[in-house]
């Protein structure tokens, strides 16, 4: 309706002596700003002077008037949207209706609201859900209808008079739509405070109890159940009675059914409280409890281990591990069922007892081929003495024992000849399968643990033979020993030890790097003609002729070997030198003379030197020395030099004939 | 201290004859020990060895194949000089013409004393 | 008879080590152990540096140093200086009528 004006708040505010009131409040005037306000109690409109009547509580007007009451209430509002009043401390008689009487410019309007004060703190009220389960989570909510800026309240909760561990969120509300402090608790409830007082208790700031609210606790939850038996300890032996029963000690509704359970599986035709075990076997031994049903569902009590206690039955040996190898260790264990448990073993190898072992583990560190065989033992405890079982075999696995490389072949053996050899051994488990042989060759087997070396070679010093099941055993190498002729034979300078000079000492060495037999004989040999016997060729002053090629011979009872032949370089000085001339010794004026310079020398001449008949050296380097044109006067005795890195060496003298041409004599 | 000092003409028409002169000072020219050459160096190709004149018990020459019909060096005993003739120069013969001392070092011989050279161009 | 053969250029900073090689044959230097070696600065007659193995003239530094193997000579200048900036050349003995040949020549600079 839009001739009404507009206003938001609570309808009504609860509060007690001497607390305080906050009215949170919206409005919207007609037409302009408020001009005049003033808070009635309990208003009455009187039609005679078309005003209203009752205590005015504030008042705000043009000329600005307040009464005093003004100090306890207060118009928290403003001209055109808050209208927010406080009254503090709010007393029992300020109860019933407060009318907010408002004037604008030409519209006015009264707006009423409750207000309820009580005499003392009125009780929070406590929400639950409406059902509640053990160990579910539940949010348990405490509220109360009051909240105040200036009055500062606190809520808590208490069970069984304790306060509460959990820890609660306090939320307030001071709003147009709702004004309220709440309080809630998250709170996982146990089967145990089904029936317990829950209290929430409204405090002042200094935790002053002001009033409070108190619920009992309704948990649903299955059956809480405890079990007895006779005897106590639950230890018989076979053909004793045994009783147990079953004694519910809370539930919630009321329990239905009742069972019994062994080892996790119901016993059939047993619903009552108490299960009566008559003649009881070893196959009643186990852990039992009993099941008691409710609409939440089944509750089952602690187990009890009923222990019927016989002697041990036949016994069975377990090997860890076999087959077992040679060296490793194996481990017997002897399994027996008994109750109690076996005290005492007694233990079989091939049916004799093994002294000393009396525990239901054997270990051996370290198994040997005797330790195969049949394991058997026997268990003991209070009730009695077992069965000795069937017994267990254990395989002990090796590598073939003793190998030997055998060689088949008559001695001496000589290369090129054919080899046989054959691999033995003494004892294998599992079966040998296969050989190998040391070094590898492309060698035959004709037959399983036989070797054939065709055309044998000198170096074949040693072979051995592996035997090989899973694993592989060699035998130590056997020594072929096989004869040859000398190998490697070279020619070797012993001295001088740097190049070989014209009238040097030279040793020549014949080596060879093995010969078997060791027995050996030398020869030297140059051009096809033999020099010598020794292992050493010896020249006291070597001269030129000796350079040729030398070969030696060294041979044995099996044969003889040559060496590469070896060149012998003698070096020396320029020798049988000469100067030759060309086109002859007589030449004619002008025309040109060659002078060679001829020689024999190793190394060959490297520098060459010229000089006339006074001994003049002329600046020619070459072997050649030509001169061109040729003149009269160079007629005469020339001679060269040569030299190397030995030496020199000088020619004699050659004579140079140079005559007049025909011109000149004919000019004379 | 040696010294070689060369004269002659800077410039010498195509066909007739090139000559230069060089005067020894220090040394003679017939000094059993050295011999008197004559290299020539032109941009195309480089350094040239001509000739060479030198006494021993005698008066030799040694000319280079290449102008060995056209190339005569004398020596001058009476004025201690050395000289060099080309005959029927071509343009080809332009070069810097030098003289030079040939000694020798240990074995073999070089060139240790050079003259200040002479620069010939032929053209008509 | 053919010239010996150079590189054209070498180049060094101060202080660094050059080496010019001067390639012939088995007719001349691999036939003596003779290699002469020239130094040239423009406008100047050659100067003899070096000779056969390491006969140097009065007054060369021993900076210069030459090697030679089998139809190669080396010419190496240690401790180069701005003055060694000049065309070096080579020079052999032959066994032909050309009784001694030169190098092309190698133009050194000193950076």
């Known amino acids: 309706d839009s001739s009404k004006w507009v206003f938001e708040h609570p309808e009504t505010l609860y509060a007690w002596e001497g607390a305080c009131v906050w009215i949170p409040c919206t409005y919207r005037a007609l037409d302009g700003d408020l001009e005049s306000f003033i808070l009635f109690h309990n208003p009455e409109y009187n039609k005679n002077t078309s005003k209203f009547d009752g205590t005015r509580l504030y008042e705000s007007t043009k000329d600005g008037k307040v009464p005093s009451e003004q100090k306890r209430v207060q118009f928290l509002g403003d001209k055109n949207k808050n209208c927010t009043l406080s009254i503090h401390p709010v007393h029992l008689n300020d109860s019933g209706q407060l009318g907010l009487r408002m004037e604008s410019k030409t519209e006015k309007w009264m707006e009423r609201i409750h207000l309820n004060v009580s005499e003392r703190p009125f009780p929070p009220h406590i929400q639950l859900p409406p059902e509640i389960q053990e160990s579910q989570e539940v949010t348990l909510t405490c509220l109360l209808n009051f909240s105040c800026y200036g009055y500062p309240i606190q809520l808590q909760w208490l069970l069984e008079g304790v306060p509460m561990r959990q820890a609660a969120v306090t939320s307030t509300s001071l709003t147009i739509k709702s004004v309220f402090t709440r309080s809630e608790l998250k709170f996982s409830p146990q089967w145990s405070h089904h029936g317990k007082i829950v209290t929430c208790q409204l405090q002042d700031a200094d935790g002053k109890f002001l009033s409070n609210d108190t619920v009992q606790l309704n948990v649903k939850h299955t059956p809480k159940l405890e079990i007895k038996v006779t005897p106590s300890d639950a230890i018989v032996r076979e053909g004793d009675s045994v009783t147990m029963t079953c004694e519910v000690s809370s539930s919630n509704p009321e329990y239905t059914t009742v069972s019994w359970l062994k080892d996790g599986t119901s016993l059939k035709k047993q619903n009552t409280f108490t299960l009566n075990l008559r003649e009881v076997t070893k196959d009643q031994s186990g852990k039992y409890c009993c099941q008691v049903s409710n609409d939440v569902g089944p509750g089952r009590s602690e187990e009890v281990f009923l222990q019927v206690q016989y002697a041990p039955e036949p016994s069975t040996v377990q090997i860890l591990h076999s087959p077992a190898v040679e060296g490793s260790q194996v481990e017997f264990l002897c399994m027996s069922l008994a109750n109690p448990l076996p005290t005492n073993y007694t233990w079989y190898h091939n049916g004799k007892e093994m002294q000393g072992r009396t525990e239901e583990k054997v270990h051996i560190p370290k198994i040997l081929p005797w330790h195969a065989g049949t394991y058997s033992c026997v268990a003991e405890n209070i009730l009695g003495t077992g069965q000795r079982g069937p017994g267990a075999e254990l395989d002990v696995q090796y590598p073939p024992k003793k190998v030997t490389t055998v060689i088949q072949n008559p001695m001496p053996i000589r290369e090129g000849d054919t080899v046989t050899l054959s691999c033995n051994y003494n004892s294998s488990n599992p079966s040998v399968t296969r050989y190998e042989w040391k070094p590898h060759g492309a060698w035959e087997e004709p037959s399983l643990g036989v070797l054939k070396i065709q055309n044998v070679g000198w170096d074949n010093t040693t072979i051995a033979c592996a035997a090989c099941n899973s694993w592989c055993s060699w035998a130590s190498p056997v020594a072929l020993n096989v004869q040859y002729a000398p190998r490697d034979v070279r020619v070797r300078k012993i001295k001088p030890l740097s190049e070989i000079h014209s009238g040097n000492s030279v040793s020549l060495q014949c080596d060879f790097s093995s010969s078997h037999p060791k027995e050996v004989q030398f020869f030297w040999e140059k051009n096809g003609r033999l020099l010598g016997k020794e292992s050493q060729l010896n020249f006291d002053s070597i001269s030129p002729e000796d350079a040729g090629s030398y070969s030696c011979w060294v041979n044995n009872s099996i044969g003889q070997t040559a060496s590469k032949a070896w060149t012998l370089e003698v070096l020396y000085a320029p020798r049988r030198l000469r100067v030759s001339m060309s086109p002859g010794d007589q030449v004619m004026e002008g025309k040109s003379a060659t002078l060679t310079c001829e020689s024999d020398a190793n190394p060959p001449v490297s520098h060459y030197t010229w000089f006339d008949w006074n001994n003049q050296s002329l600046p020619y380097h070459s072997q050649k020395l030509r001169l061109e044109p040729v003149k009269v006067q160079h007629s005469g005795a020339y001679w060269c030099q040569g030299t190397n890195s030995v030496g020199k060496g000088r020619s004699p003298l050659s004579t140079l004939t140079v005559y007049y041409s025909p011109e000149t004599i004919g000019r004379r | 201290e040696v010294q070689l000092q060369q004269s002659g003409p800077g410039l010498v028409k195509p066909s007739q004859t090139l000559s230069l002169t060089c005067a020894i000072s220090g040394d003679s020219v017939s000094n059993n020990n050295a011999a008197w050459n004559w290299i020539r160096q032109s941009p195309s190709r480089g350094l040239e060895w001509l000739g060479r004149t030198y006494h021993r018990s005698t008066w030799y020459n040694d000319y280079v194949g290449s102008v060995k019909s056209r190339i005569t060096i004398n020596p001058d005993t009476s004025k201690n000089q050395f000289s060099l003739q080309l005959n029927s120069v071509t343009p080809e013969d332009t070069a810097v013409y030098y003289c030079?001392?040939?000694?020798?070092?240990?074995?073999?011989?070089?060139?240790?004393?050079w003259g200040q050279g002479t620069t010939v161009t032929v053209s008509s | 008879q053919s010239a010996l053969t150079q590189p054209a250029s070498v180049s060094g900073s101060p202080g660094q080590s050059i080496t010019i090689s001067c390639t012939g044959s088995r007719n001349d230097i691999g036939a003596y152990e003779s290699v002469s070696w020239y130094q040239q600065h423009p406008g100047n007659a050659p100067k003899l540096i070096i000779h056969?193995?390491?006969n140097r003239p009065s007054g060369v530094f021993d900076r210069f140093s030459v090697s030679q193997s089998g139809n190669t000579a080396s010419l190496t200048i240690s401790g180069l200086q701005a003055e060694d900036e000049a065309d070096y050349y080579c020079?052999?003995?032959?066994?032909?009528?050309?009784?001694?040949?030169f190098g092309t020549g190698t133009k050194v600079t000193v950076l």
């Open positions: 056969g193995v390491n």
């Open positions: 030079a001392r040939e000694t020798d070092y240990g074995d073999y011989g070089a060139f240790d004393i």
């Open positions: 020079s052999s003995h032959t066994t032909t009528s050309t009784l001694y040949v």
